[in-house]
């Protein structure tokens, strides 16, 4: 299992919607004994490790799991739409969060976390991260622009 980020930087004018995406590459575990816990959160670029500090996004804590007996359980505590958010996971391994009507306060480092659970044991914690920069309307573009990561930044962070 590997987590990659197609884009590492999103630059958006205020008021736009933006979809941040992590891609879960799961060639080995498909159909086997692995389950996944997934979440999105805000963080900061720590001195040692990115995505170590967890803060809720718009005061929302997302919970999503892929469990064999319940293939796609979106276990968020209330509807993300109430917070102007949408969280999605598709069959191609795209795990995304959409922020509607972004404001300057939405700027920050966004992290996706995927925990691979095998035989009830959390085997690995994999992170993907990207930065969202929200700009004031004056003189900025009318749509969001996404920038791909440098080659060395494209792989996920793994924490045992």
């Amino acid at each position: 299992i590997k987590v990659t980020t197609p884009y590492s930087l999103y630059v958006c004018p205020e008021g736009q919607n933006v979809t941040l995406t992590c891609r879960i590459l799961d060639s080995v575990s498909k159909g086997h004994d692995a389950n996944f816990l997934k979440t999105w959160f805000l963080s900061s670029r720590g001195e040692v490790q990115v995505c170590k500090e967890h803060r809720p996004i718009r005061n929302f804590i997302s919970h999503h799991q892929h469990h064999r007996s319940h293939p796609a359980v979106n276990a968020s505590h209330d509807q993300p739409q109430k917070h102007g958010l949408e969280i999605a996971y598709d069959n191609h391994g795209n795990f995304s969060i959409t922020l509607h009507n972004v404001t300057l306060s939405d700027s920050g480092l966004y992290c996706c976390l995927v925990i691979e659970v095998k035989h009830h044991h959390p085997e690995r914690r994999l992170y993907g991260y990207m930065e969202l920069q929200v700009q004031t309307g004056k003189g900025s573009a009318s749509t969001c622009t996404a920038y791909p990561p440098n080659e060395q930044d494209s792989d996920s962070i793994t924490a045992a």
Epitope: K52, H63, Q65, H77, I115
Partner: antibody
Framework: QVQLQESGPGLVKPSDTLSLTCTVS?????????WNWIRQTPGKGLEWIGH???????SYNPSLRSRVTISRDTSKNQFSLKLSSVTAADTATYSC????????????WGTGTTVTVSS | EIVLTQSPATLSLSPGERATLSCRAS?????IHWYQQKPGQAPRPLIY???YRTTGIPARFSGSGSGTDNTLTISSLEPEDSAVYYC??????????FGGGTKLEVK
């Protein structure tokens, strides 16, 4: 093996400040995890008081926020609880526990210490 | 704050029987965690993230549910399962909240 041990006075007078310390062995409190205080009473059951994170940021139960301070002493690998203006309703067994960021459950607990508020 | 209501408050069953403990949330929660507490001891984590047993927990313990209704099942009771069982959520935070507990007697 990670161990947590609470210490502090077992008897506190009404209106005084309750002070407890949790000593952590086998793991550095600055490495990871959130370090929590939880109390248990026969009437209210288990109640989360608040926590301090590995980086030193704190979060408190809104119902107690005005009276609670959680701090840490990294040199001693300890974190502490102060609860001011105590009343008989604060009589409880106080425990410290650690929780990993996501999926947020308490995996290691201290044995707990009983605090009675009485004059 | 999200209130977790556990039922039944007490449950008395015989060894080998199946126990079903309920944890109902006042509004939809993410994961539910379950703990076992015996007299004079600290709570011991049993199940995390609704489904998953923590290290050393026998397979007779299982968790299920989603949204507002979650269940802890003990498939074949042993005398040492006598304890108080608590559920906990960290979805709406702060505060983290616990259920009021179910006291299970196996005799």
């Amino acid at each position: 093996q990670v161990q947590l041990q609470e210490s502090g006075p077992g008897l506190v007078k009404p209106s005084d400040t309750l002070s407890l310390t949790c000593t952590v062995s086998g793991y550095s409190i600055t490495s990871d995890y959130t370090w929590n205080w939880i109390r248990q009473t026969p009437g209210k059951g288990l109640e989360w008081i608040g926590h301090i994170t590995y980086s030193g940021s704190v979060s408190y139960n809104p119902s107690l926020r005005s009276r609670v301070t959680i701090s840490r002493d990294t040199s001693k690998n300890q974190f502490s609880l102060k609860l001011s203006s105590v009343t008989a309703a604060d009589t409880a067994t106080y425990s410290c526990a650690r929780a990993l960021y996501y999926p947020w459950y308490f995996d290691v607990w201290g044995t707990g210490t009983t605090v009675t508020v009485s004059s | 704050e999200i209130v977790l209501t556990q039922s039944p408050a007490t449950l008395s069953l015989s060894p080998g029987e199946r126990a079903t403990l309920s944890c109902r949330a006042s509004s939809s929660v993410g994961y539910i965690h379950w703990y076992q507490q015996k007299p004079g001891q600290a709570p011991r984590p049993l199940i995390y993230a609704t489904y998953y047993r923590t290290t050393g927990i026998p397979a007779r313990f299982s968790g299920s549910g989603s949204g507002t209704d979650n269940t802890l099942t003990i498939s074949s009771l042993e005398p040492e399962d006598s304890a108080v069982y608590y559920c906990q959520q960290w979805s709406s935070y702060p505060p983290i909240t616990f259920g009021g507990g179910t006291k299970l007697e196996v005799k």
